[in-house]
């Protein structure tokens, strides 16, 4: 089981749509795959695909999942909040015929304030 | 460029252990993502899968011939190794690695091949 | 374990004419998760080892010459050659990888008349 995963980086301004993308391959067929995303090490959703389609359509605050066959797990987030910032990890398990698992590498979003002057006070604000 | 290339005893005695080595060139086998496999073909006949080994060190046998068969990894030389006990005449055959990945799952790449026989 | 079975074993053609191989499966490797056919379709050469022709039931390997042409789905699969040449002699293997352990079929040794 291989799992890819991106972008690494995703810069989007609050408001918009970020969209992560999660390619899982296998190089025999797999009754049941269970898929889990993550946000800085947090479980978002962890929903199974069987028969072509996902138990859950829903993955986080503003997330929705979908499967597009042969490969494709995307997760969009829309509309995208400042608290959509992190690190996103993609997660995959064949369950069925026999437990096999891999992990994506990160995907680092970052959301840019949609007023400039947030980000200034954001900045103004750190400690030192 | 990807190279397999086989190895091992062109004659072997019943009773006796086979073992054979694939040599991989210009590819790791610590690559993500792919299966090294051991096919063989009698003369004259279909060919046989005999077991794979994946990244992740999950083997997977034939399940008519589990009991005399182990396939393990060598990712210092970059080889995969196969062992087979109890030699039979009828286990004559030419003896082939290749390699599988996950993003389609054919076998790709082949060695040419080595010819094992099996005889006192 | 999946059975495949060629039809025929032996195929004498004239060169420039048509030939098709048949493959049946004894269960689907058809994946409605992945919508792919998990169905190979590989060429032995006199001498060689065997070489990918084919792979999900009907997409040519890379550097396969278009007369090769892979259709079917389920248990059900065809390997046609619109015009045979004198360089197709082999044996064809029908394979399947949707499960292990992988099966092949028996061959079809295609021969030129």
């Known amino acids: 089981l291989s799992v890819q995963q991106g972008p690494n980086l995703l810069q989007v301004r609050q408001g918009s749509q970020a969209t992560l993308v999660c390619q899982v391959d296998q190089a025999t067929a797999w009754e049941r795959l269970r898929v889990k995303w993550t946000k800085d090490g947090a479980i978002l959703c962890q929903p199974y695909i069987t028969n072509g389609s996902l138990s859950l359509g829903v993955c986080g605050p503003q997330g929705r999942l979908s499967w597009q066959a042969p490969s494709h797990l995307t997760l969009q987030l829309d509309p995208v909040s400042l608290n959509h910032s992190g690190a996103y990890v993609c997660w995959a398990a064949v369950e069925i015929p026999e437990l096999e698992e891999a992990e994506g590498n990160i995907t680092r979003l970052f959301v840019d304030p949609d007023d400039p002057t947030q980000n200034r006070n954001r900045i103004a604000s750190f400690p030192g | 460029q990807i190279t397999l290339k086989e190895s091992g005893p062109t004659l072997v005695k019943p009773t006796q252990t086979l073992t054979l080595t694939c040599t991989v060139s210009?590819?790791?086998?610590?690559?993500?993502?792919?299966?090294w496999n051991w096919i063989r073909q009698p003369p004259g006949k279909k060919l046989e899968w005999l077991a794979l080994?994946?990244?992740?060190?999950?083997?997977s046998y034939n399940p008519s011939l589990k009991s005399r068969l182990t396939i393990t990894k060598d990712t210092s030389k970059n080889q995969v190794v196969l062992t087979m006990t109890n030699m039979d005449p009828v286990d004559t055959a030419t003896y082939y690695c290749?390699?599988?990945?996950?993003?389609?799952?054919?076998?790709?790449?082949w060695g040419q091949g080595t010819l094992v026989t099996v005889s006192s | 374990d999946i059975v495949m079975t060629q039809t025929p074993l032996s195929l004498p053609v004239t060169p420039g004419e048509p030939a098709s191989i048949s493959c049946r499966s004894s269960?689907?490797?058809?994946?409605?998760?992945?919508?792919?056919?998990?169905l190979d379709w590989y060429l032995q050469k006199p001498g060689q080892s065997p070489q990918l022709l084919i792979y999900?039931?009907?997409y040519r390997a890379s550097g396969v010459p278009d007369r090769f042409s892979g259709s079917g789905s389920g248990t059900d699969f065809t390997l046609k050659i619109s015009r045979v040449e004198a360089e197709d002699v082999g044996v064809y293997y029908c394979?399947?990888?949707?499960?292990?352990?992988?099966?092949f079929g028996q061959g079809t040794r295609l021969e030129i008349k």
């Open positions: 210009g590819f790791s086998i610590t690559t993500g993502g792919y299966y």
């Open positions: 999900h039931a009907s």
């Open positions: 394979q399947q990888h949707y499960e292990t352990p992988l099966t």
């Open positions: 269960q689907s490797l058809f994946s409605s998760n992945t919508k792919r056919n998990y």
């Open positions: 290749a390699d599988m990945a996950d993003k389609g799952g054919w076998f790709a790449y």
């Open positions: 080994i994946y990244t992740s060190g999950r083997t």
